[in-house]
Amino acid sequence: EEELQVIQPDKFVLVAAGETATLRCTATSLIPVGPIQWFRGAGPGRELIYNQKEGHFPRVTTVSDLTKRNNMDFSIRIGNITPADAGTYYCVKFRKGSPDDVEFKSGAGTELSVRAKPS
């Protein structure tokens, strides 16, 4: 059985300020069981953007319905983009663990660039 891959097909996404950014991510397998999280940036200082397991993130909506048990599309939309949202976004698969889930595999990242709203 092939190991799960996290695929972020878009290396770059350009969005106008005030618009909605779509960041695409798919997993190639349902195994291992565990949530997806999205981060901006890498390393210890990365910023959590969306956590499938916990919380409500008002600016973020999922493209597909993650409550469906066979879902492997973890793409998100971020609304009302501002220049402060620019950065590289990573879709990260976690493996269910006890007491804490363990980071399993990350996508290659999508760099979000924001262009000023046309005046």
């Epitope: 499938q52 397991k53 916990e54 919380g55 909506t61 999922t62 993650l66 409550t67 006890s98």
Partner: antibody, heavy 120, light 107 residues
């Protein structure tokens, strides 16, 4: 099998406090968000509070905000609802329920409920 | 807050009949609408999650449809054990809200 058993209900005077407990078994408690929902006699269901699996995210209904506190102890597989400054309108059956993963998931198992009566 | 309005509030029907209950949301909840059944003196039971997905162990005569603001629960052929109160519930955004319930009674 999945079991959720509420306890701690009873008759209490207005302004007093009560602590409800929900004992969970038959599943990995720490994987699930947990919810309190209440139902006043002869009325519909009202969501009261929810807590995420690691207690990082907590939400309350406006009607109980500042008076009720939801908490959990994953080492004991227990969910709690501390109810302070109780009012007559808090009289209801209180159910605990579980919710797998994130905010958008449904409540797939419920306890049998515990009755809270607020009366002088 | 997202208000949910169920229709009808009560309904009399016969065994074998097809029954439809609707739930309208005051704003879009995408597909994050769930349906529960509650019998007197019992806890609610999940029937349908995320608009159209049948929960494990629930008979296939129950089905759900809809997205956005309009949702439907259908029972294709009523059985005696289906007489109960049905609630819709949204989980698109906090606070979670429930419909006021639809009481299904035997005609």
């Amino acid at each position: 099998q999945v079991q959720l058993v509420e306890s701690g209900g009873g008759v209490v005077q207005p302004g007093r406090s009560l602590r409800l407990s929900c004992a969970a078994s038959g599943f990995t408690f720490s994987d699930y968000g947990m919810i309190w929902v209440r139902q006043a006699p002869g009325k519909g269901l009202e969501w009261v509070a929810s807590i995420s699996s690691s207690s990082s995210y907590i939400y309350y209904a406006d009607s109980v905000k500042g008076r009720f506190t939801i908490s959990r102890d994953n080492s004991k597989n227990r969910l709690y609802l501390q109810m302070n400054s109780l009012r007559a309108e808090d009289t209801a059956v209180y159910y605990c329920a579980r919710r797998y993963y994130g905010f958008n998931y449904p409540f797939d198992y419920w306890g049998q409920g515990t009755m809270v009566t607020v009366s002088s | 807050d997202t208000q949910l309005t169920q229709s009808p509030s009560s309904l009399s029907a016969s065994v074998g009949q097809r029954v439809t209950i609707t739930c309208g949301a005051s704003k879009s909840v995408r597909t994050y609408m769930h349906w529960y059944q509650q019998k007197p003196g019992k806890q609610p039971k999940l029937l349908i999650y995320s608009a159209s997905n049948l929960e494990a162990g629930v008979p296939s005569r129950f089905s759900g449809s809809g997205s956005g603001t309009d949702f439907t629960l259908t029972i294709s052929s009523l059985q005696p054990e289906d007489f109960a109160t049905y609630y819709c519930q949204q989980s698109n955004e906090p606070p979670y809200t429930f419909g006021q319930g639809t009481k299904l009674e035997i005609k």
